[in-house]
């Protein structure tokens, strides 16, 4: 079976304050079973940005329908960007476990930085 790869094609994403940013993430395999979460930063200080399974993330929408059985696109859009949103964003695959899911693999990350100011 093919080993799972987490693909985040953009190393750097320049965004404009007040606009919407699209962060891309695709996976190469449906296995192992488990959710994909988005974080900003790494280690214990990382910030949870999106979890499809629980929580309410009002500024985040998914590009694809994550409920579809064979979905491999976990890209997200973050609306109304502010300077506090800058940082490196990672899509992270978790393996379904009991009682908790276990982190399995992370994408390489996309750095979000502020580009041109709104005119």
């Amino acid at each position: 079976e093919e080993e799972l790869q987490m693909i985040q094609p953009e190393k750097l994403l320049l965004v404009t304050v007040g606009k919407t940013a699209t962060l891309h993430c695709t996976v190469t395999s449906l296995l192992p079973v488990g959710p994909v979460l988005w974080f900003r930063g790494v280690g214990p200080g990382r910030e949870l940005i999106y979890n499809q399974k629980e929580g309410h993330f009002p500024r985040v929408t998914t590009v694809s329908d994550l409920t579809k059985r064979n979905n491999m696109d976990f890209s997200i859009r973050i609306s109304s960007i502010t300077p506090a949103d800058v940082g490196t964003y990672y899509c992270v695959k978790f393996r379904k476990g009991s009682p908790e899911n276990v982190e399995f693999k992370s994408g390489p990350g996309t750095e979000m930085a502020l580009g041109a100011k709104p005119s």
Partner: antibody, heavy 119, light 108 residues
Framework: DVQLVESGGGVVRPGESLRLSCAAS????????MNWVRQAPGEGLEWVSR????????DYAESVKGRFTISRDNSENTLYLQMNSLRAEDTAVYYC????????????WGLGALVTVSS | ETVLTQSPATLSVSPGERATLSCRAS??????LAWHQQKPGQAPRLLIY???RRATGIPDRFSGSGSGTDFTLTISSLQTEDSAVYYC??????????FGGGTKVEIK
């Protein structure tokens, strides 16, 4: 319904310690950043500290840095504020407040816990 | 650090009249401004976020406007239960999160 209930307030002498707790219910506690905000008698609101959803990222107001420690137990849905080396100017009602998303305002507040520091 | 200045400090308004509260930021905060209401002896309650969006369960007599550095909270027809202190909060730059000094609304 979201509920935040603080406990642990009381009267202490300058230099002493106190630990506040905030029991959360009605939402996915582990998905949200949480904050402590205080209000001295007859004064306005002062942000004290923030902790990210996972518990590994913390921020503090300059006035409490090095003396106060924020923490959380996601398995118990509880937020804490350990207050050491208390001063008279720390006398206030301390509110725990849920954050709307990782970079947002406070959408729910607890009822508050009164901390009095007096010799 | 962004400083939020609220005016007036106290506002006396008769029931049924309009109340207009101001919050000015020392630098732009885009639309990232919230308003909280605090009645005497109670915890704060969120009224408005993103400058103009009403929080869940907030009556439509409360409205917010503005962007950048100048913001307004309007209570279109003041009710006796609206007697409270109103605070603005910015969340464009943080930490720290900043609140304005508050405006006390009194019923004439």
């Amino acid at each position: 319904d979201v509920q935040l209930v603080e406990s642990g307030g009381g009267v202490v002498r300058p230099g002493e310690s106190l630990r506040l707790s905030c029991a959360a219910s009605g939402f996915s506690f582990s998905s949200y950043a949480m904050n402590w905000v205080r209000q001295a008698p007859g004064e306005g609101l002062e942000w004290v500290s923030r902790i990210n959803s996972g518990g590994g990222g913390t921020d503090y107001a300059e006035s409490v840095k090095g003396r106060f420690t924020i923490s959380r137990d996601n398995s118990e849905n509880t937020l804490y504020l350990q207050m050491n080396s208390l001063r008279a100017e720390d006398t206030a009602v301390y509110y725990c407040a849920k954050q709307y998303d990782w970079n947002g305002f406070f959408d729910y507040w607890g009822l508050g816990a009164l901390v009095t520091v007096s010799s | 650090e962004t400083v939020l200045t609220q005016s007036p400090a106290t506002l006396s308004v008769s029931p049924g009249e309009r109340a207009t509260l101001s919050c000015r930021a020392s630098q732009t905060v885009g639309s990232k401004l919230a308003w909280h209401q605090q009645k005497p002896g109670q915890a704060p309650r969120l009224l408005i976020y993103d400058a103009s969006r009403r929080a869940t369960g907030i009556p439509d007599r409360f409205s917010g406007s503005g962007s950048g550095t100048d913001f307004t909270l309007t209570i279109s027809s003041l009710q006796t239960e609206d007697s409270a202190v109103y605070y603005c909060q910015q969340y464009y730059y943080w930490p720290p999160y900043r609140f304005g000094g508050g405006t006390k609304v009194e019923i004439k």
